[in-house]
């Protein structure tokens, strides 16, 4: 059927979109983990 | 202190291959977002690709189906390796940790018979 | 891909003048720019974050605003320093065939 041909080869639905992290400091060590702005 | 340092470039003819090491040090790589940035020479930058920390890949168009990104925890180092090459791909490529003042020094590609 | 459209591509100035930067994003990008300075034969430096958060150590004579798909980047007062190559940057991300990272063709601020 359509709908069935339609779940095969249908675009899958994607990970939500993720903005890149930023990480403003100078200098880091890994106990300061940045983050996503406005995530 | 955080560092990052490219190493693998070179002369390549085109339609060779070449992988680009980005060795990291005063983090861990696979804790970060990490991008792939390249400057031709006398140009601008373009983002080619990136990983995300969890080891998600994205890719410019310029560089899909003949890049790839990858990382080696073990060795704290990223990777770009880079197939069918041409001309165009002739730029100095930089590391970047994310968004954020920390670039390796950059290492040159060119790309020329 | 994510286009980036940068405006003027050269710009000549004097020390003193107040400096503006605009960056067009070919889709919405929420407040995910970035602002980068380049002199010759170095790495760029992150000027701003956020469309408008200065990052550590830079003069308060710069200043970022904008959301969606217009940003601004202004230098109140120009000094011997500041000529240099500007460029945006798009941060907002991938997803699927979509590739968010993307930077603007850069202004470079030289000496009238």
């Known amino acids: 059927s359509y709908s069935m041909e339609h779940f095969r080869w249908g675009k899958p639905v994607g990970k939500k979109r993720r903005p890149v992290k930023v990480y403003p400091n100078g200098a880091e060590d890994e106990s300061a983990e940045a983050f996503p702005l406005e995530f | 202190e955080v560092q990052l340092v490219e190493s693998g470039g070179g002369l390549v003819q085109p339609g060779g291959s070449l992988r680009l090491s980005c060795a990291a040090s005063g983090f861990t790589v696979s804790n970060y977002d990490m991008i792939w940035v390249r400057q031709a020479p006398g140009k601008g930058l373009e983002s080619i690709g990136m990983?995300?920390?969890?080891?998600?890949?994205y890719y410019a168009s310029s560089a899909k189906g003949r890049f790839t990104i990858s990382r080696d925890n073990s060795k704290n180092t990223l990777y770009l390796q880079m197939n069918s090459l041409r001309a165009e791909d002739t730029a100095v490529y930089y590391c970047?940790?994310?968004?954020?003042?920390?670039w390796g020094q950059g290492t040159l590609v060119t790309v020329s018979s | 891909d994510i286009q980036m459209t940068q405006s003027p591509s050269t710009l000549s100035a004097s020390v003193g003048d107040r400096v503006t930067i605009t960056c067009q994003a070919s889709q919405s990008i929420s407040s995910y720019l970035a602002w980068y300075q380049q002199k010759p034969g170095k790495a760029p430096k992150l000027l701003i974050y956020?469309?408008?958060t200065l990052a550590s150590g830079v003069p308060s004579r710069f200043s970022g605003s904008g959301s969606g798909t217009e940003f601004t980047l202004t230098i109140s007062s120009l000094q011997p320093d500041d000529f240099a190559t500007y460029y945006c940057q798009s941060y907002d991300g991938s997803s699927g065939s979509s590739y968010g990272v993307g930077f603007g063709g850069g202004t470079k601020v030289e000496i009238k």
């Open positions: 990983i995300y920390d969890d080891g998600d890949t």
């Open positions: 970047v940790k994310g968004v954020s003042n920390h």
């Open positions: 956020s469309a408008s």
